[in-house]
Interface confidence: medium
């Protein structure tokens, strides 16, 4: 049994278990998977489709499938249906949508759910060069090696929010390894890492995870990791920055982020003090008020948030702590020659709502080249469509991603960091424990 660990894939595998309902006569249903959308081979998974109380039947369709995948009658109170996969195999990996039928007709399709299976290939090996014991400020490269040639490598840090780096070599060039350079190393980089490998032609199939690699950072200052209870809307700490490549100048990024962190802590302490002061004042005043007045205080004003339902059965599978603690870095890397320039394309998911600093990179050839026609990879972030560059170019940094041991296979990329903005949309109706305040763009990589 693979040990359970959680990290969020930068591609937004299932866009979280909740998707927005749309207004109209037949709102689209929501689709999610339990215990998560990334399942190891042989394990069971349940797909849920939630529509309305008027639903008479639910239908699950798998993308690129010639027939309805499954159909189910609704469970009482008729607003959802369960589709069970008793044993995860390659056949079940893929992209799903669901519909429901009401007396009016069939609904719009749900947002897609992408079911990923791990255990499709033998596990790669993960090692650290020159050593897993590294001094703060120095460089280290994590090396993920597979026995057979693969074209996608994914590095995961346990309890981190996103894959640290996702290297994808395209144009059919397959390699036995991928290098993930980190420089300069800080205490933030310490922890347990694993890597996966995959083939581009089967985007929903990952290898077994590598054995864990413990990266120990010595001689470092106190761990600057923010508190697990930190709100997702606070300023991004150093952990939200991408890993720095060897020899790159981080534009004083780390020092500036220490300053930001200290500033945030100071402001937090001040706000906390102010809050305590106000509470104390309120409590003092409250002692001299009538019971009726006090009761009036506790009545919810119009428009105030409804209390969350207690049913925890349908809550997100990602912990709030995990949601904000990753080195948020994801790159789709194409095989290039050294003389090739690269242009950066910063993309943002149409569903992006987490105001976390996340760096996405898609590396393109600047010289015209025939692209391979392939569906967007759920691991590469290629489906993230908006080319809206945020006005945060001051945070840009040079980085390099080595996709193989061959010198000609090194791709140099200019990464533009941007902050995901809160969309000006109404929060979805609170549904059975889903917190509208914390919508996640990412699916939990929970290996069960």
């Amino acid at each position: 049994m693979i040990p359970t660990f959680t990290a969020l894939l930068c591609l937004g595998l299932s866009l979280g278990p909740r998707t927005h309902m749309q207004a109209g006569p037949l709102p689209k249903p929501t689709l999610w998977a339990e215990p998560g959308s990334v399942i190891s081979w042989g394990n069971s998974v349940t797909i849920w489709c939630q529509g309305t109380l008027e639903a008479r039947e639910y239908r699950l369709d798998k993308e690129e499938s010639p027939a309805p995948w499954d159909r189910q009658n609704p469970l009482e109170p008729k607003n959802k249906a369960r589709f069970s996969i008793p044993s995860m195999t390659e056949d079940y990996a893929g992209r799903y949508r669901c519909y429901y039928r009401s007396p009016v007709g069939w609904s719009q399709p749900s947002d897609p759910l992408e079911l990923v299976m791990t255990g499709a290939y033998s596990k790669p090996t993960l090692s650290a060069l020159p050593s897993p014991l590294v001094t703060s400020g120095k460089s280290v490269t994590l090396l993920c090696q597979s026995r057979s040639p693969m074209d996608t490598f994914l590095l995961i840090k346990e309890r981190a929010a996103h894959p640290l780096l996702h290297l994808r070599s395209e144009h059919g060039a397959q390699q036995h390894q991928a290098e993930f350079p980190m420089s300069p190393v800080t205490s933030v980089h310490g922890g347990t890492y694993r890597c996966f490998s995959s083939h581009g032609f089967s985007h929903y199939l990952l290898s077994h995870p590598s054995d864990p690699l413990e990266l120990i950072v010595s001689g470092s200052l106190e761990d600057p990791r923010p508190s697990p209870t930190r709100s997702v809307s606070t300023a991004a700490g150093p952990e939200d920055q991408p890993l720095m490549p060897t020899g790159s100048v981080p534009h004083s990024g780390l020092r500036r982020h220490w300053e930001v962190l200290i500033g945030v802590l100071v402001v937090s302490i001040l706000l906390l003090s102010l809050l305590l002061f106000l509470l104390l004042q309120h409590w003092r005043q409250g002692k001299h008020r009538t019971l009726a007045q006090r009761q009036a205080d506790f009545q919810r004003p119009p428009g105030a948030a409804e209390p969350e339902p207690k049913d925890g059965g349908l809550q997100r599978r990602s912990s709030p702590a995990a949601d904000v603690q990753g080195e948020n870095f994801c790159a789709a890397v194409k095989n290039t020659q050294p003389e090739d320039g690269v242009e950066m394309d910063t993309r943002q998911s149409p569903h992006d709502e987490d105001p976390q600093a996340v760096t996405y990179a898609k590396v393109k050839h600047s010289r015209p080249r025939r692209e391979m026609a392939s569906p967007p990879s759920p691991l590469s972030g290629e489906f993230l469509d908006t080319k809206d560059r945020q006005a945060e170019e001051d945070r840009q940094m040079d980085t390099e991603a080595a996709a193989s041991e061959a010198p000609q296979d090194v791709t140099y990329a200019q990464l533009h960091s941007f902050t995901l903005r809160q969309k000006a949309t109404e929060p979805p109706p609170s549904q059975e424990g889903a917190s509208p305040a914390e919508p996640s763009v990412y699916a939990t990589l929970a290996i069960h």
Epitope: R59, K62, E64, P66, A67, P68, R71, P86, D91, P375
Partner: antibody, heavy 120, light 115 residues
Amino acid sequence: EVKLVESGGGLVKPGGSLKLSCAASGFMFSSYWMNWVRQAPGKRLEWVGDINKDVTTTNYSPSVKGRFTISRDNAKSILYLQMNSVKSEDTATYYCVRNHGSRYAYFDVWGQGIQVTVSS
Amino acid sequence: QSILTQPPSISESLGSTARLTCTLNNGISVGGKNIYWYQQMAGSVPRLFLYYYSDSDKELGPGVPNRDSGSKDTSKKAANLQISELQVEDEAVCFCSIYESNTWVFGSGTKVTVL
């Protein structure tokens, strides 16, 4: 008239290769998933594999996976089945079949079938 | 063992009703499946006989008479095909079929003989 006509069958030695073709007429070929289904003498129908409309997806029965390849030419309205490393158990009548493609998705048009015999 | 099990043959007298069963194995729920019945007469090509999901969601194949109907027995994990008022021309092999895990699966077929 909607019609599917198979060709290319015959006798082939074990380990050998054979390519079947299916010419479609009377309908918009590129709008349908297409299938190959086979039937050994006196036996059940056995689905071989299918291909989607725009040639991006193929699925195969476990018994032929890795040996058979389905392809199509939408411009010519032809479906192909490339059979490699054939075995004696591949001996059957091979039908070219159209998937109706609505949410019912049944096989609504069948070719007359072509005989493939694997024997040394 | 096949996913779909059918009895090899059934014999019924002219004008009576033939009931064919198709049992789903491997833990597959019949409730959520579209069931397809194909009929193959001797020396002929198979044709769709009946598509059945529920009484409100079914379709007879082209030229198939209205005396044929489908049903499901969820407790027995079985799909049923009923051919009433049997005629001589109903003599054929009937195959049930489902779509499961990226593949189409056929039952072994039931030979219907009209006495």
